[in-house]
Interface confidence: low
């Protein structure tokens, strides 16, 4: 038998420095977690102790903090090189700065293979990007070889900016021929490494013949066997075992997100490359693991350029700003309320005595809120904090929509509720009640909107044939997160102001903020 140790990360999202337990900015260093310096310590410890070790990343290193805002991916290449990653799969966020923003800082600089079998380049890009990413890579590990085949969410064109010269194919359809090719090359130990979410990871394990292990990302799935060490609730055991269509037991793993854990999976193969056993658990990278001094020194050197971003206090919060995905993708969260209030405030235009304002409504995809802000840092809110909350550099735009389109949008908001998907809407100037016991497409039981043509604003039922103005992220106006009905049915779309600027201006204006959860979004069963 031959034993392989797979160390894996996914959805690190620019958390190069250690963070607080909820993956926002580190406030109390003795309780902070993750970061590349701490990760390196643990990786090196395992490399010294065990003979056959692979360090893999399943995508979405890009986007999430000021590190990416400033360094635009150069930091990813530099520190992944320093940690000596063996391979990385492309995630959707690797395309956030377009293909050029992937090629120059990362693909050309990485000293490790970057993989995706289901992304095919066409047109002039094909020659430009040729060889810079690969469908698979055969890696020597000890006396054996291991094949790594990559995949990326086929939803990437809806989630990021890959342009028109990359085609994202169905994962399973694209993976099978590459795995077959590896088999013809006498590679009998094959890992599928990719970024399509846990449901697709399980399907790949089930459907793709010849894949021995699946290492995934995108859904920030936390798997754990036994008592979990932190706040994350496991979605299943680690590894999650899928029985393939041809009867094999295929381990599937993922390691939550934000560099908080290092996935640790030990696989035992027989001489024919069959998995005999698999076991392990994510390792919580808490403060009991010291930060490697050389990597930490390098982080501090790179940090200098960022410091002028983090010193400017915009205002103060006296409450915790809950921007966690656990809240904002499932229920009303006060970070969503803050952002929506800022969006409306930014659009105040008292132009007509009949109207208190020309627009009263805001919608905001919960998936666009990427971080909380802890009030215990003296209440300070900085540009850097907001860049972690709103890292995508989008704009908050003004659209005109019919009530019927809004109703469809709110149905879409909860059509697959409970899967931590980004389309769950945060709101302003809207009161919505959902009944999740009803079938998808018929879950909105009450939808009231704040009047504009009134001297005292109050909530009235949405009228299907009335035209309403709504402030929303350009991402939604462009049909992102599946809101195709907005893109297809909007009557007018005006580009707005940069998202961080809107919120920072509002906070500067308010000076002290204390947004609450106040019943904008409610759930009922049966008669409400």
């Amino acid at each position: 038998a031959w034993e392989l140790t797979i160390l894996h990360t996914n959805d690190v999202h620019s958390r190069l420095e250690q963070t607080s337990e909820d993956s926002s900015k580190c406030v109390n260093a003795s309780r902070c977690m993750g970061g590349v310096a701490r990760l390196f310590t643990k990786v090196q410890q395992i490399r010294r102790a065990e003979p056959n070790v692979l360090l893999l990343d399943a995508g979405d290193q890009y986007q999430g903090t000021i590190w990416f805002t400033v360094y635009k991916g150069a930091e990813v290449a530099h520190f992944m090189n320093a940690l000596r990653y063996d391979a990385m799969a492309l995630g959707n966020h690797e395309f956030d700065n377009g293909v050029e923003g992937l090629i120059e800082p990362l693909l050309k600089e990485a000293k490790f293979p970057i993989l995706s079998a289901n992304i095919k380049a066409k047109g002039p890009l094909a020659s430009q990007i040729s060889g810079l990413y690969l469908p698979y890579k055969v890696l020597p590990v000890g006396d054996e070889v291991v094949g790594i085949v990559g995949y990326t969410s086929k939803e990437t064109p809806f989630l990021s900016n890959p342009g028109t010269n990359l085609v994202f194919e169905d994962e399973i359809t694209a993976l099978q021929p590459e795995v077959d090719k590896l088999k013809t090359l006498n590679v009998n130990k094959i890992i599928a490494l990719g970024h399509s979410g846990f449901e697709m990871d399980k399907l790949i394990a089930q459907k793709v013949r010849g894949v021995d292990v699946v290492v995934g990302g995108h859904s920030n799935t936390f798997l754990y066997t036994g008592n979990p060490p932190s706040k994350e609730v496991p979605a299943g055991k680690y590894p999650f075992i899928v029985t393939s269509d041809d009867g094999r037991k295929v381990p599937v793993v993922q390691a939550y997100a934000f560099g908080k854990y290092l996935g640790y999976l030990k696989i035992e193969f027989d001489e024919r490359g069959n998995v005999i056993s698999s076991h392990g658990n994510p390792i919580l990278l808490n403060s009991s693991i010291p930060e490697d001094p050389s990597i930490k020194a390098d982080i501090n050197k790179w940090r200098i350029k960022l410091d002028n971003y983090s010193t400017q206090e915009l205002g103060k919060t006296i409450v915790y700003l809950d921007g966690s995905s656990q809240s904002c993708r499932f229920r009303e969260c006060n970070m969503g309320n803050l952002i929506c209030d800022a969006m409306i405030n930014n659009n105040l235009r008292h132009t007509d005595e009949m109207f208190w304002n020309h627009v009263s409504m805001c919608i905001l995809n919960g998936g666009g809120i990427r971080s909380p802000i802890d009030e215990r840092n003296n209440g300070t809110i900085t540009w850097e904090n907001l860049a972690a909350v709103l890292p995508f550099g989008g704009t908050f735009d003004l659209v005109q929509l019919k009530g019927s389109t809004l109703k469809k949008a709110f149905e879409h908001s909860v059509h697959r509720y409970g899967q931590s998907t980004g389309e769950f809407l945060q709101v302003g100037g809207i009161h919505v009640v959902y009944d999740l016991s009803r079938k998808p497409g018929d879950r909105v039981v009450k939808l009231d909107v704040l009047c504009t043509k009134c001297r005292v604003p109050s909530y009235d039922p949405l009228k299907m044939d009335e035209v309403y103005k709504v402030i929303l992220p350009n991402f939604l106006a462009n049909g992102g997160d599946g809101f195709q009905m907005i893109k297809d049915e909007l009557l007018r779309h005006d580009s707005g102001d940069q998202d961080i600027n809107v919120v920072s201006t509002y906070i500067s204006k308010m000076k002290v903020i204390y947004p609450a959860v106040e019943g904008r979004i409610k759930f009922s069963t049966g008669s409400h």
């Epitope: 235009r349 132009t351 003004l398 005109q400 007018r492 005006d494 707005g496 102001d497 940069q498 600027n501």
Partner: antibody, heavy 119, light 106 residues
């Protein structure tokens, strides 16, 4: 295609009032979010923003010139008018109108009109 | 009001050179900065907005960076048509412009 064109007198006397008209095409000032501004540039010097007007008739003026400036629009004729009172030789400049984008940067400019203040 | 101090006021360079122009705001303007190119007798043309976003149709040799008070316009490899005057502009409060940088052929 967006175009803007400034018109007005090439020469005005000190203490007189300057009236400039910006005639534009390719967009409508009744479109939500749209704005048109005026910027001037004395010969060989820097640009100075004067005023702008929004689609909803909201008006903004440079604080240092506010008492002398009036901006207005005629949406149906696709025109924006700027008046500047009590002209002085230091007001000699090329006056540009421009379409406001997002907050207040200017993507589309007219070719400019040179106004000389002299007796 | 917010002063925008641009440096240098003039600059001589050759085709192919890398050129950097800086602009300092008298107070924090976040990333609310645009850069313009102006040729003699012509209106300014926007190159960069929101500090680092290249305007549609602007060649990739032009790039902007900065946040807060310090901003930079970089031309990676000067072309003959790039000799002109460059202005920065903040729009965090009412718009103000830098005094300009005249880029001349060496």
């Amino acid at each position: 295609q967006v175009t803007l064109r400034e018109s007005g007198p090439a020469l005005v006397k000190p203490t007189q009032t300057l009236t400039l008209t910006c005639t534009f095409s390719g967009f409508s000032l009744s479109t939500s979010g749209m704005g048109v501004g005026w910027i001037r540039q004395p010969p060989g010097k820097a640009l100075e923003w004067l005023a702008h007007i929004w689609w909803d008739d909201d008006k903004y003026y440079n604080p240092s010139l506010k008492t002398r400036l009036t901006i207005s629009k005629d949406t149906s004729r696709n025109q924006v008018v700027l008046t500047m009172t009590n002209m002085d030789p230091v007001d000699t400049a090329t006056y540009y109108c421009a379409r406001r984008e997002r907050w207040a940067w200017f993507a589309y400019w007219g070719q400019g009109t040179l106004v000389t203040v002299s007796s | 009001d917010i002063q925008m101090t641009q440096s240098p006021s003039s600059l001589s360079a050759s085709v192919g050179d890398r050129v950097t122009i800086t602009c300092r705001a008298s107070q924090n303007v976040f990333t609310n900065v645009a850069w313009y190119q102006q040729k003699p007798g012509k209106a300014p043309k926007v190159l960069i907005y929101s500090a680092s976003y290249r305007y549609s149709g602007v060649p990739s040799r032009f790039s902007g960076s900065g946040s807060g008070t310090d901003f930079t316009l970089t031309i990676s490899s000067l072309q003959p048509e790039d000799f002109a005057t460059y202005f920065c502009q903040q729009y965090n409060s009412y718009p103000t412009f830098g005094q300009g940088t005249k880029l001349e052929i060496k």
